[in-house]
Interface confidence: medium
């Protein structure tokens, strides 16, 4: 049975600033044919037929649901892209994470401007902070890492706060063991 294709993002963030670039790639098993990919944005078929969809100079209307399909194989699960205009944007490698998987958070400044005195918060409580901008990495996410995250920082001497982001860590499905 052919596997569903999967949409991946490069860079891996599904929340980006207006004007930034992101590449969506449709990955799957044994898809060798060029120009055999269908891309859907908010349900509408895109003109792009390559396995990669480049979003250059992102606009607000690029926000929404993206799915891909290779020939007659099932559509991929949707990926949601959000385009923002703000001083700070909290980005996550995934908003729904399987327990045991890594989770990366990034406090991203508008136009890649330097952000310093960065503090990450979870459920209103300060997590780690740095004077330069660092990412937070959780190597093995647990259910306790679920929560509402945001970051604060200084851009051009002024203090800003990102919009909150909900992160959900779900339990990995139990393996089924059969008696031999």
């Amino acid at each position: 049975v052919p596997q569903k294709p999967k949409v991946s993002l490069n860079p891996p963030w599904n929340r980006i600033f207006k004007g930034e670039n992101v590449t969506l790639t449709c990955n799957g098993n044994n898809f060798f044919e060029v120009s055999s990919t269908k891309w859907f944005h908010n349900g509408s078929l895109s003109e792009e037929t390559n396995s990669s969809l480049n979003i250059v100079n992102a606009k607000f209307e690029d926000s929404g649901e993206y799915k891909c399909q290779h020939q007659q194989v099932n559509e991929s699960e949707p990926v949601y892209l959000e385009v923002f205009s703000d001083w700070l944007l909290l980005q996550a490698s995934a908003e729904v994470v399987m327990e045991g998987q890594p989770l990366f958070l990034r406090c991203h400044g508008w136009r890649n401007w330097d952000v310093y005195k960065v503090i990450y918060y979870k459920d209103g409580e300060a997590l780690k902070y740095w004077y330069e901008n660092h990412n937070i990495s959780i190597t093995n996410a647990t259910v306790e890492d679920s929560g509402t995250y945001y970051c604060t920082g200084k851009v051009w001497q002024l203090d800003y706060e990102s919009e909150p982001l909900n992160i959900t860590v779900i339990k990995a499905p139990r393996e089924k063991y059969w008696l031999q």
């Epitope: 310093y116 005195k117 780690k128 004077y131 330069e132």
Partner: antibody, heavy 119, light 110 residues
Framework: EVQLVQSGAEVKKPGESLKISCKGS????????IGWVRQMPGKGLEWMGI????????TYSPSFQGQVTISADKSISTAYLQWSSLKASDTAMYYC????????????WGQGTMVTVSS | QSALTQPASMSGFPGQSITISCTGT?????????VSWYQQQPAKAPKLLIY???KRPSGVSSRFSGSKSGSTASLTISGLQTEDEADYYC??????????FGTGTKVTVL
């Protein structure tokens, strides 16, 4: 009251090991970096290194890298500074200090631990 | 990294003003708005006087003020009083969670 309480004065011989402590209270110890500062007799303050007790992330001054080890035990809200082999030149007052992210400074200081290394 | 440069000593009469300089580099003082100043009385732990170049914590006298121009920070003590006799140290964030202190200035009230 937010405070850092350091262990008492120590007199050691060259070559001996030592671990001094700094216990935090009155705040969430795991959420603020703790720095260590040396002051040799009659001299100025020297920044040695810093630790984030929440995950033991540590940074050292190049002058002290490999000379000392900074660690923390978050279960008892205590940071440590240790030497594996003391030298006479380690004779100094050692302070721990709490970093404050909202002021970018060391806002709370321990009372200091005097370490004397002499044969 | 090298210590920030401060004058070894300064003195003034009660009521006068003195300004202590603290010279660093573009990598520390010049790169961050994170210069702090500490007062150390004899046989005491340092006490925070100024943070973020020019801000004063609550409880610190308004006679103490900080400023910065380029890679040089300054601490001004106005209306000098006998209790201001102490050692003063600047400190700057120097990147990647490192700090550097100044060489220290001994202030004498004549």
């Amino acid at each position: 009251e937010v405070q850092l309480v350091q262990s008492g004065a120590e007199v050691k011989k060259p070559g001996e090991s030592l671990k001094i402590s700094c216990k935090g209270s009155g705040y969430t110890f795991t959420k603020y970096w703790i720095g260590w500062v040396r002051q040799m007799p009659g001299k100025g303050l020297e920044w040695m290194g810093i630790i984030y007790p929440g995950d033991s992330d540590t940074t050292y001054s190049p002058s002290f890298q490999g000379q000392v080890t900074i660690s923390a035990d978050k279960s008892i809200s205590t940071a440590y500074l240790q030497w594996s082999s003391l030298k006479a030149s380690d004779t100094a007052m050692y302070y721990c200090a709490k970093d404050n992210p909202f002021t970018g400074s060391f806002d709370i200081w321990g009372q200091g631990t005097m370490v004397t290394v002499s044969s | 990294q090298s210590a920030l440069t401060q004058p070894a000593s300064m003195s003034g009469f009660p009521g006068q003003s003195i300004t202590i300089s603290c010279t660093g580099t573009r990598d520390d003082v010049g790169n961050y708005d994170l210069v702090s100043w500490y007062q150390q009385q004899p046989a005491k732990a340092p006490k925070l006087l100024i943070y973020e170049d020019n801000k004063r914590p609550s409880g610190v006298s308004s006679r103490f003020s900080g400023s910065k121009s380029g890679s040089t920070a300054s601490l001004t003590i106005s209306g000098l009083q006998t209790e201001d006799e102490a050692d003063y140290y600047c400190c700057s964030y120097a990147g990647d969670y490192t700090y550097v202190f100044g060489t220290g200035t001994k202030v004498t009230v004549l």
